[in-house]
Each structure stands twice: as C-alpha cells, then as structure tokens.
C-alpha cells in the first residue's frame, strides 16, 4: 500500500503520500484555528506507471495508454486514497468549540 | 459540474473531462476484444485552482495552501468523479462472451 | 540550524522591571509562535505566554496576566518578554521555546533572574 | 484550565530496567501532547510530540503512547543519560499547562 507507513520510510520516485506540514495561520491564514497550530496534512505526488496502485480499469487502461503512448498528455494521476480526520479547537466568542474536520489528513495514495 | 455536457462545449483550461479515444488494438495491444473496436474513454486534465470542484476538505486545504505558497509543488490533481461501464465483446474460442467492463468511461472530473 | 540564544543573567531590586530578549536564527521567526517558560529553582516547568511575531497577536496565562509582557521585533529576529514589579517570587530561570507541530521543539538556554534587595 | 497530573513525582531505578511515566489531563487534550527530558541545569529537550511521535534524534528505546485524557510515555533499557526530570505538556488550548515532573533517579 502507498501509505505513510511505505512512503515516508522509502525513496520512492512514483506515486506515494509525501509529509506537508500546513501551518494555519502562516499557510492558509486561518486564524480562526486556535488548536493545534497546525498539522501534516500530506499529500500526494509521483508518476503512476503502467499498474501502479491503480484504483479502477480506466486508471489500468490509461496507464497502459501511457506506456504504449508515451507522448500522450493523458494518464493517471496520484490523489489522496485514505484520508483521516482532524480535531480541532476554535472559538466563538469566548466560547471554546470542538470540531472534528473530515478528511484532512492523506494516509494512503492511489493512482486515479 | 466538470462532466462531458460542460467541457466538451467550452474552451476550458482549468480541471476538466477530456475526449479520448482509445483503439484496442493499436493503443493498447489488446487483439482479443472484438467488438467495439476501440471507445471514448476520456480523461480528466487541467489547473485545480482553490475551491473548484473539491472532493474533500484536504482538496480544499490543499488548493488555498496553493494559492497562498505558489511555488508549493503540493497542489490537488484533475481525476476522474464518475465512470461509466463498457459492454464488450470477445470470443473464448469460437464462442462469443459478452461482458461488462467496469469504471471505462470517464464522465466528469474532480480534484482531489 | 535553529537556535535561540538568550539574554545573560539579571539581577534586580524588588519593584524593578526587566527585559529579558532571544534572538532567533536558522528558521522563519515571524511565522512561529514563540513561548515563554518559567522554572523556580528545583521546582518544575510553567507556561506564561506566546506571541506571534508576524502580527504580534499573544495569548498569556492568566496568572502571569499584568505581570508579562510579550513583545517580538521582526527586523532583528528577537522575541521579548518584559517582567514588572518584581518579587522574589519572580526569581527563576526564564526559557524561551519555538512552538512548532504541537510542541515546543527547540529551547533557549534559559536567563537567570534574581530578585533582591 | 486543563490540569496536567504526571505520576509517579520520583523513580529510582536501575540501568537496563524499563520505566513508565504517566500524564492524565483534565479533559480531552486529542493527543496533542508533547514529553520532554530536562537534565540539572540545562533547558528541556523535545522527546515526543503529538503524543506518540517520536522527535528527530531522540533513541528508538523511548516510545510515547495513549489519547483522550491518559497517556505515557515508556523508556526501555534504560541508559545512564536518560536520568534525569521528565514533563509532559499539553497544547489544546492555552494556557498550555506542564505535568509536574518525573524525578527518575539511579538506584
């Protein structure tokens, strides 16, 4: 699996999740999070070959495309697959208020 | 949405459905299906730009990230949202199968 | 590499006030919080505040309200913490501490603060 | 305010043997929890972040577990340079108050 467990232990050129730490205040200028002051978000980047975690027959087809076709401007590209969410801490007033955000953080990548 | 209806009528240079068609047997080597003898698989390219067509939070997070650190190499990727399946033809033997291949046809596209 | 190097040891009368500095190098200042730590001798660790240098936005603990003041200078890369009407109570080693991804990663060698008469 | 209560305040215990040190929060603090290791005399060093990751250059023998409100952190096989004090603190909304301390002695 092209997860945080592979990927960040591994040189890995292809597709795989990649830490990015997003600071929110300074990276989105989200003030309004008081907690935590910013999280590793991750994401996804490298090239997806012929096979590579492909995630339905179109991604297998275009990737076989893309092989055969080198020149083509059309293949897979590597996106989130597992993303898990996050907890935060802002505040209405002088109301503190817990939110859990979904979807937040990439786990896992697939090529799509 | 970023489906066929929309791209293919509009000169549209951000995140979009693309038309592609692919011959079995001269793009991908495929001689053993029979009929059709190739299809419209499309694909989806083009820019993510903040807020178009985010599949989840982390897209979003990841398109203002973008917006705010353009020379970030993180930014969200143009990928398929709906597929369609594609009835297929070929012979096991002498006797004809039909079968229905699923996630074929890219319909719209999202960034994720 | 990052370093925060402080201020050198302070000794001041009760009633007095004083300004103890860190100087930052090896990151981004303006976009980190910066915190502030007191420790009495033998005893443990307690948070006073933080500031954001880039717009000097800071957030105390409400027992050092009145008593701290934070301050950041973006031009020399140099976080302050102003401490007034001093007590003996006040004496201790005063750190400053970069807040990075929930945690206080890297720490200053501490300022020594003595109050006496 | 969230109260942080660190147990046991003192340890004596020898090389070689492992040793757990806890941390309880007053409330949910959702693991954004940090350790560290003061030596006599010098400032506090990162050990763990985020409750359970570990920071750069700090031995694979420490390892910091839990969530919620109940966590620790586990020292194995101890070493002469991991005697020392021992805090956690927690970042889930300031102030961010500091466990009193772990004093862990050699017998």
């Known amino acids: 699996a092209l997860d945080t467990n592979y990927c960040f232990r591994n040189l890995e050129e292809n597709c795989c999740v990649r830490p990015l730490y997003i600071d929110f205040r300074q990276d989105l200028g989200w003030k309004w999070v008081h907690e935590p002051k910013g999280y590793y978000a991750n994401f996804c980047s490298g090239p997806c070959p012929y096979l590579r975690s492909a995630d339905t027959t179109h991604s297998t087809v275009l990737g076989l495309y893309n092989t055969l076709n080198p020149e083509a401007s059309a293949s897979p590209c590597c996106v989130p697959q597992d993303l898990e969410p996050l907890t935060i801490l802002y505040y209405v007033g002088r109301t503190p208020k817990v939110e859990q955000l979904s979807n937040m953080v990439v786990k896992s990548c697939k090529c799509s | 949405a970023l489906d066929t209806n929309y791209c293919f009528r509009n000169l549209e240079e951000n995140c979009c459905v693309r038309p592609l068609y692919i011959d079995f047997r001269q793009d991908l080597g495929w001689k053993w299906v029979h009929e059709p003898k190739g299809y419209y698989a499309n694909f989806c390219s083009g820019p993510c730009p903040y807020l178009r067509s985010a599949d989840t939070t982390h897209s979003t997070v990841l398109g203002l990230y973008n917006t705010l650190n353009p020379e970030a190499s993180a930014s969200p990727c143009c990928v398929p949202q709906d597929l369609e399946p594609l009835t297929i033809l070929y012979y096991v033997g002498r006797t004809p199968k039909v079968e229905q291949l699923s996630n074929m046809v890219v319909k719209s596209c999202k960034c994720s | 590499q990052v370093q925060l190097q402080q201020s050198g040891a302070e000794l001041v009368k009760p009633g007095a006030s004083v300004k103890i500095s860190c100087k930052a190098s090896?990151?981004?200042?303006?976009?980190?919080?910066m915190n502030w730590v007191k420790q009495r001798p033998g005893k443990g660790l307690e948070w006073i505040g933080q500031i954001y240098p880039g717009d000097g936005d800071t957030n105390y603990n409400g027992k050092f309200k009145g008593k701290a003041t934070l301050t950041a200078d973006k031009s020399s890369s140099t976080a302050y913490m102003q401490l007034s009407s001093l007590t003996s109570e006040d004496s201790a080693v005063y750190f400053c501490?970069?807040?990075?991804?929930?945690?206080?990663?890297?720490w200053g060698q501490g300022t020594t603060l003595t109050v006496s008469s | 305010d969230i109260q942080m209560t660190q147990s046991p305040a003192s340890l004596s215990v020898s090389v070689g043997e492992t040793v757990t040190i806890t941390c309880r929060a007053s409330e949910n603090i959702y693991s954004n929890l940090a350790w560290y290791q003061q030596k006599q005399g010098k400032s506090p060093q990162l050990l763990v972040y985020a409750a359970t990751n570990l920071a750069d250059g700090v031995p694979s023998r420490f390892s910091g577990s839990g969530s919620g409100t109940q966590y620790s952190l586990k020292i194995n096989s101890l070493q002469s340079e991991d005697f020392g004090s021992y805090y956690c603190?927690?970042?889930?909304?300031?102030?961010?108050?500091f466990g009193g301390g772990t004093k862990l002695e050699i017998k």
């Open positions: 603190q927690h970042f889930w909304g300031t102030p961010y108050t």
């Open positions: 090896g990151y981004a200042f303006s976009s980190s919080w």
């Open positions: 501490a970069r807040h990075y991804d929930g945690s206080t990663d890297y």
